[in-house]
């Protein structure tokens, strides 16, 4: 049975030509992570294999950091990295578990603006 | 160069135990994580085994969990794979495998092999 | 366990053709998919990864593409030293898995 609960950054907001750190954190499971794998989309980003380590897609190495941790560093942010990121951890035994971060480039005066008037 | 070299191949007796070494060169080996491979006779590759770069963490397929130790020895260069309750499935050409580059996803080092055959 | 189908054990072609050599995923493996060339008495040599990047040193009659679950290695112009196996690998979840193989033969 799958008891595993993801906790992730939820939705984030950064400001163009800024960077980000997408965090995910699997918890509740003693089971083994064999590997993480970032999407955004459709498009697969980078695995951090438990054992043999990173591999980032040549598509997203220039812009693509690994860590830290499991997670993933997004630089020179431009407004199409707008949009949905998901951390996929492969387990033994439990299986996949799929979390989601929605991401906000903002031009930078707008998340400045954003920043100065946010609800508590 | 790199250069990776098995030995420690032989024939061994359903239910017996056998050790394989790979001696790895031209690299920085405490640095990058390990896998063992293996080619049956008709040809199928399978991945039986890897480990990180400092021996903390190993991952094993159901078809040889609980029978295959993987291990290094940093200091010697040395890769391992201890093989016990062996069975005639396990008969195929065991090859140690590397990759280095964050962007590589695969293996682009590997040895020449070593041979097991268990057989009565 | 991902399971990767290539259906052609054998192929078989003449120097100069264009070859396609397939492989299909049981389940979405998006771009982590390696392929490797092994001649007679050799390990195993990487090719292409990541779907599409060719290895250092690799002539560029060497494509890889892939279109949804199937994923393609293509030889422009066969060339004698090319007459090998090919293997497919995913490494998007573990276990990392491997094809059948495909056996390319001169006609």
């Known amino acids: 049975m799958m008891t595993g609960t993801i906790e992730t950054t939820g939705n984030i907001s950064a400001e163009k030509g800024g960077s980000i750190i997408l965090q995910c954190h699997l918890s509740s499971t003693t089971a083994q992570v064999t590997q993480v794998n970032w999407e955004q989309q459709d498009q697969l980003l980078a695995i951090c294999n438990a054992d043999l380590g990173w591999h980032i897609s040549p598509s997203f190495k220039d812009r693509v950091a690994p860590g830290p941790g499991l997670g993933l560093t997004l630089q020179s942010l431009t407004v199409n990295d707008t949009g949905e990121y998901f951390c996929i951890y492969h387990t033994y035994p439990d299986g996949t578990y799929t979390g989601r971060i929605f991401l906000e480039v903002l031009e930078s005066s707008v998340a400045e603006h954003g920043a100065r008037f946010q609800i508590p | 160069d790199v250069q990776l070299v098995e030995s420690g191949g032989g024939l061994v007796q359903p239910g017996g135990s056998l050790k394989l070494s790979c001696a790895a060169s031209?690299?920085?080996?405490?640095?990058?994580?390990m896998s063992w491979v293996r080619q049956t006779p008709d040809r199928r590759l399978e991945l039986v085994a890897t480990?990180?770069?400092?021996?903390?963490?190993?991952y094993y397929p159901d078809s040889v969990k609980g029978r295959f130790t993987i291990s290094r020895d940093n200091a010697r260069n040395t890769l391992y794979l201890q093989m016990s309750s062996l069975k005639s499935e396990d008969t195929a050409m065991y090859y140690c495998?590397?990759?280095?580059?964050?962007?590589?996803?695969?293996?682009?080092?590997w040895g020449q092999g070593t041979t097991l055959t268990v057989s009565s | 366990d991902i399971v990767l189908t290539q259906s052609h054990k054998f192929m078989s072609t003449s120097l100069g053709d264009r070859v396609s050599i397939t492989c299909k995923a049981s389940?979405?493996?998006?771009?982590?998919v390696a392929w490797y060339q092994q001649k007679p008495g050799q390990s195993p040599k990487l090719l292409i990864y990541?779907?599409?990047s060719r290895h250092t040193g690799v002539p560029d009659r060497f494509t890889g593409s892939r279109s949804g679950p199937d994923y393609t290695l293509t030889i422009s112009s066969v060339q004698a030293e090319d007459l090998a196996l090919y293997y497919c690998?995913?490494?998007?979840?573990?276990?990392?898995?491997f094809g059948g193989g495909t056996k390319l033969e001169i006609k």
């Open positions: 990541w779907a599409s």
């Open positions: 495998a590397t990759r280095t580059g964050t962007e590589i996803l695969g293996f682009d080092f």
């Open positions: 031209g690299f920085t080996f405490s640095s990058y994580g």
């Open positions: 389940q979405d493996v998006s771009t982590a």
């Open positions: 690998q995913q490494q998007y979840s573990t276990p990392w898995t």
């Open positions: 480990i990180n770069n400092n021996g903390g963490s190993t």
